[in-house]
């Protein structure tokens, strides 16, 4: 199969002319049978031509198909293929002038679009519209056989598909869709041009689309001054292209001198050296296949970059605490570059940087170096330190930015009690000032144990971490290798670079938080009265464990006490507690005995039950009410007592028993049940009673006795008694005792409101005091009776009884606190001097 090829596989000229009058006919496109009908389509680009040499108008040659051929720039060697089956080439050389004068001549460029989806042919007439416009049509006929050698000879016209080309006055464009799978096939095509009834056909052409790719122009063209003061021109690589590209960069530098350059590179960047401040650069870039095939892309849109009058390189530095950093600067002032010896450096325009930190790189480049940097403290919205390069007279408003981040991020890890996963936590708080940064945990695992000095490896894995509501990130390793060393660090990624925290190595086995002990029980032991706590250790880990017990009185706010157990085999502990009759709440936790890892959570709480643990500590305090005529030898006595509190009953009272003893009747007992009073007949000279409290364990061993004795009831031991109301809630009683020969055990104060039905109230007080504050609700203007009884071992003595408060001409005053003060020190005369200013103050601070 003989095909006509243009000189260049993607750019060529097509010369179309009418035949000479001697020609029998004009040849059909190579290899295509002659009897094809003319093709339809719309076009505006073909022109009417007047052939001066023959005087024939094109319109007179309607329905005639004229042959076109390819030519080079000079129009030489214009060749066409005959339609004969032998495939012999009929070549004729025609002077270019003939084509220019007698035909329709085209400049054609064909290429494969960069995204490999479309084959495009672009046509422009060579002559700038020398003829009148006709209603022109251009069609492109194509076929995409996989292998050309398999084609029938000649190829069948029917196998060709047609696309109509879009034409304007100046140009036409034909689009051939190429399936992605066929970009390496041969594309057979020819053009058919119709204008004013005249049809021209190009020879049959063959192209491989993949070899004529025209990439899209590069995107993302940008410029920056590098850390070493060069201009870096960079652009984005074209990820869609399935082949490597080369790039051509052209730039125009307008500085103290103007220079223009074009360079070809295979990378996506180009360095231009010796950039000066106050310069401008206009840059464009285009691309083409690296192997040289195909078509150069269009130029990208021009980008303009202007360097500032003060140039810092680098303009920004991101670094970590403790590191060193340097900035260089070129300072141009009023079109003159300042000598580097005249440059001074300032930090935040607040402090001049010492000249010992300066270096002269060249005549115009000054360098400042910072050593052992401290973390940048954010100042308002500024999260960096501003480093200013200044001349000796003034500072330019531009500055370099120094970001110093504390990357000492503590990563703490914890292996769960089932030994199935390790959870690591870390806080980004030290790096929150670095806006636009992302953080990630990276790690690598060593098969066994941790290295002495963990280090960051270039090959590391990323661990997905989730930000928690408490501001910490949490990352889970599952499954885990208990004895593998996990070296991990935090990487901070930022547009200015990335920083790594110091690596730490964690052995999952060393950070276990065990499950809490289970089956925790608590009880107060009988008789010993200790808090006994028992538990079972968790299944994992298998290491020896220590235990910690916490216990406290159950309530809203528990005041915990703790007890340590270091015996790994221990499963219980007994602890002394102050209150044997309260509900204690107990919890146990554990950790490895060697101190590695963490304490477990506290176990579920266990509670003690309140049960009797010992016999009651003592019997109840009791007093009596006397009925009947004082002159009679037989009187009813009612004993009264307050129910025993838990701390005394240890921990409950089942019943009370009253023991009687008289000279005549000996000893006998009365079971009172849970009543708190008992009435009996006092008929003998002396009658002693004792009240015992009994719980499930036994009877109280320490008990109070009271002896009723006729002789003792006449013993007058209380000399005087006074009562003073200090407020509506407190009355002070004071007394004097007269010497006697009896053993005074204690005193009993009795009081009652004589205007009320409330009944008598009483208090047992020590024998060695001579005043006492009674706290009750007192109505100062109502009538009260106060009695003071001396209680001797031999029996109850004669009481001193007073009705009402002690009468004095009391001046009512306000005390310091503004509270109604019913008495004051000067109100107290003579015997009342027993009550001092101190007593009054005691009341007011009670």
């Amino acid at each position: 199969l003989n095909l006509a090829y243009p000189t260049s596989p993607w750019r060529f000229k097509l010369f179309c002319a009418p035949p000479s009058t001697t020609d029998d006919s004009f040849l059909s496109p190579a290899g295509v049978p002659n009897n094809t009908s003319s093709l339809k389509g719309a076009s505006e680009a073909l022109v009417e031509a007047k052939f001066n040499s023959t005087g024939i108008y094109v319109s007179e040659l309607s329905k005639t198909i004229f042959h076109c051929c390819f030519g080079n720039e000079q129009g030489q060697n214009c060749s066409a293929l005959t339609g004969n089956t032998e495939g012999k080439t009929l070549a004729s050389v025609v002077k270019p002038l003939v084509f220019r004068q007698l035909g329709v001549n085209w400049d054609i460029e064909c290429w494969m679009k960069g995204d490999l989806t479309l084959f495009i042919c672009h046509m422009e007439p060579l002559l700038k519209n020398p003829f009148k416009n006709y209603d022109s049509k251009v069609h492109l006929l194509y076929d995409l056989p996989e292998v050309i050698d398999d084609l029938p000879l000649p190829p069948l016209k029917d196998s060709f598909q047609t696309v109509q080309c879009n034409c304007s006055v100046r140009e036409c464009e034909c689009h051939v869709p190429v399936p992605r799978a066929k970009v390496n096939y041969a594309l057979l095509m020819y053009l058919e041009i119709t204008s004013a009834g005249v049809s021209f056909q190009s020879p049959l052409m063959s192209l491989q689309p993949m070899l004529v790719v025209k990439p899209d122009p590069p995107l993302g063209l940008r410029m920056e001054v590098t850390d070493d003061g060069n201009l870096k021109i960079s652009w984005d690589s074209q990820t869609k292209a399935p082949f490597p590209l080369q790039y051509q960069v052209k730039y125009l530098e307008n500085s103290t001198i103007v220079r223009e350059a074009a360079e070809i590179v295979s990378d996506t960047s180009l360095l231009v050296d010796s950039v000066l401040p106050g310069s401008s650069y206009e840059v464009q870039v285009r691309s083409k296949r690296l192997d040289g095939s195909g078509v150069w892309s269009d130029w990208s849109l021009p980008q303009l970059f202007t360097t500032q009058d003060v140039m810092y390189f680098p303009p920004k530095i991101l670094t970590s605490v403790g590191s060193n950093a340097s900035f260089c600067c070129i300072y141009k002032n009023e079109n003159q570059t300042i000598s580097s010896k005249q440059i001074v450096w300032w930090m935040n325009l607040a402090e001049k940087i010492p000249e010992t930190q300066y270096n002269t790189v060249s005549d115009h480049i000054s360098k400042v170096t910072f050593s052992n940097l401290k973390a940048t403290r954010p100042r308002g919205k500024f999260t960096y330190d501003a480093v200013y390069c200044c001349n000796e007279q003034a500072c330019h408003h531009r500055y370099a930015e120094l970001y110093v981040i504390d990357v000492n991020i503590n990563i703490s890890c914890e292996t769960d009690g089932y030994l199935t996963k390790m959870t690591c936590r870390w806080s980004p708080s030290t790096i929150q000032s670095l806006v636009g940064s992302t953080v990630q945990l990276r790690y690598h695992r060593r098969s066994l144990y941790c290295p002495d000095n963990p280090s960051i490896r270039p090959t590391s894995e990323l661990k997905n971490c989730v930000l928690q509501t408490d501001g910490f990130y949490e990352c889970v390793f599952q499954p885990i290798f208990l004895l593998s060393g996990y070296t991990m660090w935090i990487r901070i990624n930022h547009s200015l670079g990335s920083l790594d925290s110091p690596p730490t190595c964690v052995l999952p086995d060393s950070v276990v938080k065990p499950l809490p002990p289970s089956n925790v029980k608590a009880e107060i032991t009988i008789n010993t009265g200790l808090l006994k706590v028992s538990w079972e250790k968790p299944v994992f880990p298998e290491n020896n464990l220590q235990f910690q017990i916490r216990y406290g009185l159950n309530g809203k706010e528990i005041q915990w006490k703790t007890h340590e157990v270091f015996d790994a085999k221990s499963k219980s502990a007994s602890l002394p507690v102050s209150d044997l009759c309260a509900v204690y709440v107990v919890q146990v936790r554990c950790r490895r005995l060697d101190g590695l890892g963490y304490w477990s959570n506290w176990s579920s709480p266990a509670y003690t039950l309140v049960m009797d643990v010992k016999v009651p500590m003592r019997g109840p305090e009791f007093w009596r009410i006397m009925d009947g005529d004082i002159t009679k030898k037989e009187r009813n006595v009612t004993l009264l007592w307050k129910p025993l509190m838990k701390n005394d009953s240890l921990c409950s009272v089942r019943r009370y028993v009253v023991k009687h003893r008289t000279a005549h009747n000996g000893t006998w007992s009365q079971d009172v049940g849970n009543q708190t009073n008992l009435t009996f007949l006092w008929a003998e000279s002396a009658h002693t009673v004792t009240v015992l409290a009994i719980n499930s364990i036994g009877a109280s061993l320490v008990n109070f006795n009271l002896t009723f004795s006729w002789p003792m009831s006449k013993v007058n031991a209380v000399q005087s008694l006074s009562a003073y109301p200090l407020s509506s809630s407190c009355v002070i009683l004071s007394w004097t005792l007269s010497p006697n020969d009896y053993s005074l055990l204690y005193l009993v104060i009795e009081w009652k409101n004589l205007n009320d039905d409330d009944g008598m109230k009483w208090l047992r007080i020590p024998s060695n005091v001579n005043k006492y504050y009674i706290h009750d609700n007192f109505i100062p203007i109502e009538k009260y009776q106060f009695s003071l009884y001396p209680v001797f071992m031999e029996g109850v003595g004669k009481p001193k009884i007073i009705n009402g408060f002690t009468k004095d001409d009391i001046a009512k005053q306000q005390n310091d606190a503004g509270e109604q003060k019913l008495i004051s020190e000067e109100d107290l005369g003579g015997e009342q001097k027993l009550i001092s200013e101190e007593d009054l103050h005691h009341h007011h601070h009670h």
Epitope: P725, S728, S729, L754, N755, D756, N777, I779, P780, I781, E782, K783, G804, F805, T806, K807, D808, I810, K812, Q820, L822
Partner: antibody, heavy 117, light 108 residues
Framework: EVQLVESGGSVVRPGESLRLSCAAS????????MSWVRQAPGKGLEWVSG????????VYADSVKGRFTVSRDNAKNSLYLQMNSLRAEDTALYHC??????????WGQGTLVTVSS | DIQMTQSPSSLSASVGDRVTITCRAS??????LNWYQQKPGKAPKLLIY???SLQSGVPSRFSGSGSGTDFTLTISSLQPEDFATYYC??????????FGQGTRLEIK
Amino acid sequence: EVQLVESGGSVVRPGESLRLSCAASGFTFDDYGMSWVRQAPGKGLEWVSGISWNGGITVYADSVKGRFTVSRDNAKNSLYLQMNSLRAEDTALYHCARARYGGADYWGQGTLVTVSS
Amino acid sequence: DIQMTQSPSSLSASVGDRVTITCRASQSISSYLNWYQQKPGKAPKLLIYAASSLQSGVPSRFSGSGSGTDFTLTISSLQPEDFATYYCQQSYSTPPITFGQGTRLEIK
């Protein structure tokens, strides 16, 4: 039957004085403290003063302290309220009452004091 | 001083109704609270003392309850003679004795 009868109420000018009396009967007078309670026209009850059974303790509301004096004569079963420097806001029906339960269990019908210029 | 606040300040009810009047103290007064009834032109009369004890001679349809800061006087079945003004009074911190502002009970 407990009876308390107040007397001495009248119309006086601001700044003037007045002495109210309360005659008690039907109970042992010297066993009880006594109180004066007043009620301004259309208003609620306001405790004024109190005295203990033996006169040893006297107490007053802040509004009358220093102007009113309470006293008693147990021999005469009588209670008194000496009111000096009277003000318009002292206008009220003044009841004497027997002190009990931190309040008053029996009250007199009251005597009207009007302070007006 | 302890302040006493009664609610409502007035209420209308019918004979046979159950009526509740509440009294609130500005601080805890334990059970030291009395209730009084006063009819127009008459002296007050003690109904309840110590929050819940019925004064002798007072009908049993009157009852009191509460302790601390909140107290109630309840009339279980209102009678025609019960239409009056009711006062609460604290006796916890005296002097001074302080009364509530009163609750007027009217016939509906």
